[in-house]
Interface confidence: low
């Protein structure tokens, strides 16, 4: 759980939309909980189905996979987690808060040509070589990039990313996911993991219940959770007796 | 538009140094992987080093692990590679461009710059 603690809020958003967990706004008192669940996603799917060893189809660090045991963090969904993604069928108007992208999940994918990378894909043999050192705030936003959001965006839909389809079969594949459109003359967006499902998906409240232990101590947080339920309750208090006193007040006037 | 302009390349004998440059304007990338890559004649590009957004964290592919050396000037917005020892097998065309991992996979730009050519001589 502790490779999770050097990625950024936005970063930690990111994987929860790649997995599919529905999730809120991830703040200091939500962290822990979240970096729970990512945790137990990865652990399950890594249970259920063990590591491909074949080699990636791209240039990117999230497709080095490795069969080494410490190199399982840091593999990419399924083809099959990939798909869900992708759903034609989803038109929630789920808004894409961050990397650079103003749209929602329910618009139309560009079917423009894809460009030089997408002719070139590669695999990399020296993926374990990548992978033995690698920690996970080798990532590709720090959380101080979620303050510049609503700009033009600046990567483009018409990658090596643009269509699932040329990636190895499913039995044995790791794929990326599909990079959002956004209509800009730079032929540039940057890339959304959009993380749809075939159901609709909506914001779900984040009960108390399914806090992980000491969930409400968040690390931005400057007077912890008990404390600020403390504070609360020493307000309502004395709100009660103010109002005490002056209903006593009124009933006796001398 | 965001461009990568790589640099720093050129003609050197086996053994001697070179530093690359890869500036970025249109947009900071201090936030961002970043990553240099190689094509050789007649082969396919590859991985040779990355660094994380932070500069904390670096990657290198085997073949160059103690030979090079991968460093990022987030105040310049810009990324080097430092090449030492170097072998005839290093000759290439070394680009660079934006990398990440599993959180956003295939992060990097469409168009790739034009690179620069480092020749080793034996």
């Known amino acids: 759980m502790d490779n999770y603690a050097d990625l950024s809020d936005t970063e930690l958003t990111t994987l929860l939309r790649r997995y599919n967990i529905p999730h809120g706004p991830v703040v200091g008192s939500t962290r822990r909980l979240y970096e729970k669940k990512i945790f137990e996603y990865e652990t399950q799917r890594r249970r259920l189905s063990p590591p491909s060893s074949s080699a990636a189809s791209s240039y990117s660090f999230s497709d080095l996979n490795s069969t080494r045991g410490d190199a399982d963090m840091y593999d990419l969904p399924k083809k099959e987690d990939a798909l869900l993604y992708q759903s034609k069928g989803y038109n929630d108007d789920y808004y894409e808060e961050s990397y650079f992208t103003t749209r929602t999940y329910g618009e139309p994918e560009s079917a423009g040509p894809s460009r030089a990378v997408r002719q070139s894909v590669t695999s990399f043999p020296d993926a374990d070589a990548f992978h033995h050192q690698v920690h996970d705030d080798d990532l590709l936003s720090s959380s101080e990039e979620e303050c510049k959001d609503r700009e033009r965006p600046m990567y483009g839909r018409d990658s090596a990313y643009q269509s699932i389809t040329h990636y190895r079969p499913v039995s044995a594949s790791r794929s990326s996911l599909d990079l959002s459109y956004y209509p800009t003359s730079s032929s540039t967006s940057f890339m959304s993991s959009s993380s749809s499902s075939s159901s609709w998906l909506t914001r779900r409240a984040i009960r108390p219940e399914n806090r992980a232990p000491g969930a409400g101590l968040g690390q931005d947080r400057q007077v912890p959770l008990w404390g600020q339920l403390l504070l609360f309750l020493v307000f309502v208090i004395v709100l009660f007796f103010i109002y005490h006193f002056m209903q006593a007040e009124e009933g006796n006037p001398f | 538009d965001v461009q990568l302009v790589e640099s720093g390349g050129g003609l050197v004998q086996a053994g001697g140094s070179l530093r690359l440059s890869c500036a970025t304007s249109g947009r900071s990338l201090s936030s961002y992987a970043m990553a240099w890559f190689r094509q050789a004649p007649g082969k396919e590009r590859e991985f040779v080093a990355g660094?994380?957004?932070?500069?904390?964290?670096?990657y290198y592919t085997d073949s160059v692990k103690g030979r090079f050396n991968i460093t990022r000037d987030n105040a310049k917005n810009t990324v080097y590679l430092q090449m030492n020892s170097l072998k005839p097998e290093d000759t290439a065309v070394y680009y660079c461009n934006v990398g990440g991992r599993k959180v956003l996979a295939g992060t990097f730009f469409n168009d790739w710059g034009q690179g620069t050519q480092v020749t080793v001589s034996t």
């Open positions: 660094i994380n957004f932070s500069g904390r964290r670096t």
